[in-house]
């Protein structure tokens, strides 16, 4: 059974992941972003279901494509290099989903834009955090 300290740790990690995802969204979904139109042409796979931490496997599998899109951005738009930002997210995701269980991600039929993709995972984080508090 999860202890109060492990729950608190999970909550803090989810809050960190949430802030990272929101920061990326803020850098992209902005009228001052010269590459917004181009970035919106890239398609991302969305999870069929995302209600548990194990479903973060679906996010992990899309981190490489996410990094590739972020590489289009001007360096002044990101004070962290996309590679470092995605690396930070990857570390949190691996800790949250755990590596001991293998989960096959199921994707929805419809693909999504980067904005829809980020909003979906932001909502996921907020939802899990609300169940922990």
């Amino acid at each position: 059974a999860p202890t109060s300290s492990s729950t608190k740790k999970t909550q803090l990690q989810l809050e960190h992941l949430l802030l990272d995802l929101q920061m990326i969204l803020n850098g992209i979904n902005n009228y001052k972003n010269p590459k917004l139109t181009r970035m919106l042409t890239f398609k991302f796979y969305m999870p069929k279901k995302a209600t548990e931490l194990k479903h973060l496997q679906c996010l992990e599998e899309e981190l490489k494509p996410l990094e590739e899109v972020l590489n289009l951005a001007q360096s002044k738009n990101f004070h962290l290099r996309p590679r470092d930002l995605i690396s930070n997210i990857n570390v949190i995701v691996l800790e949250l989903k755990g590596s001991e269980t293998t989960f096959m991600c199921e994707y929805a039929d419809e693909t999504a834009t980067i904005v829809e993709f980020l909003n979906r995972w932001i909502t996921f984080c907020q939802s899990i955090i609300s169940t922990l508090t």
Epitope: M23, N26, G27, I28, N30, Y31, K32, N77, H79, L80
Partner: antibody, heavy 120, light 111 residues
Framework: QVQLVESGGGVVQPGRSLRLSCAAS????????MHWVRQAPGKGLEWVAV????????YYADSVKGRFTISRDNSKNTLYLQMNSLRAEDTAVYYC?????????????WGQGTTVTVSS | DIVMTQTPLSSPVTLGQPASISCRSS???????????LSWLQQRPGQPPRLLIY???NRFSGVPDRFSGSGAGTDFTLKISRVEAEDVGVYYC????????FGQGTKVEIK
């Protein structure tokens, strides 16, 4: 001095069109992004549209997308808002505002506004 | 869209006394460039909006130092240290971290 002056407002029937203008003076117009923001009677501020300094990018609020078109003529130092298929809910004072995307000030200069009334 | 929520919606104050307005965003306003694009605007009766504060706490040119902004992330505050008659009007918070959105406005009036 730095100035933005809107014009073109008036009373118009639902479904009709109107074109607003915003004349800029006292600054290098072609270096600034330009916004339209509106305010319905007795209500708060609502962002409508933005155009880049060179006209290369344009974005709209969902409420006006497909009906309004923002444009600019840098040779005339003028910003425009073409409003088609007008609805009663478009009734508002329309302000233009400038923004230097590199300065981080945000919308630092606003016009006095022009009133649009959509009524049958 | 990022939703901006202001409190209170109305603030009756005594001349010379302080006033404080809060603004909360539905998500973090920290941009990937490290900046937080949160502004405060003043709209006097019958006038267009006027920029007071940009990037949380930076006073725009010509703005009296009785106006100050603070906050971080999702919670922000505008303070008027000593309210003067000319401060009467509606104050709006506004974010431009994503596409611009405004708070509902807070009406500052003299008691």
């Amino acid at each position: 001095q730095v100035q933005l002056v809107e014009s073109g407002g008036g009373v118009v029937q639902p479904g009709r069109s109107l074109r607003l203008s915003c004349a800029a003076s006292g600054f290098t117009f072609s270096s600034y992004g330009m916004h339209w923001v509106r305010q319905a009677p007795g209500k708060g501020l609502e962002w409508v549209a933005v155009i880049w300094y060179d006209g290369s990018n344009k974005y709209y609020a969902d409420s006006v997308k497909g009906r309004f078109t923002i444009s600019r003529d840098n040779s005339k130092n003028t910003l425009y808002l073409q409003m088609n298929s007008l609805r009663a809910e478009d009734t508002a004072v329309y302000y233009c505002a400038r923004e230097d995307f590199d300065s981080h000030y945000g919308m630092d200069v606003w016009g006095q506004g022009t009133t649009v009334t959509v009524s049958s | 869209d990022i939703v901006m929520t202001q409190t209170p919606l109305s603030s009756p104050v005594t001349l010379g006394q302080p006033a404080s307005i809060s603004c909360r965003s539905s998500q973090s306003l920290v941009h990937s460039d490290g900046n937080t694009y949160l502004s405060w605007l003043q709209q006097r009766p019958g006038q267009p909006p006027r920029l007071l504060i940009y990037k949380i706490s930076n006073r725009f040119s010509g703005v009296p130092d009785r106006f100050s902004g603070s906050g971080a992330g999702t919670d922000f505050t505008l303070k008027i240290s000593r309210v003067e008659a000319e401060d009467v009007g509606v104050y709006y918070c506004m974010q431009t971290t994503q596409f611009p959105t405004f708070g509902q406005g807070t009406k500052v009036e003299i008691k």
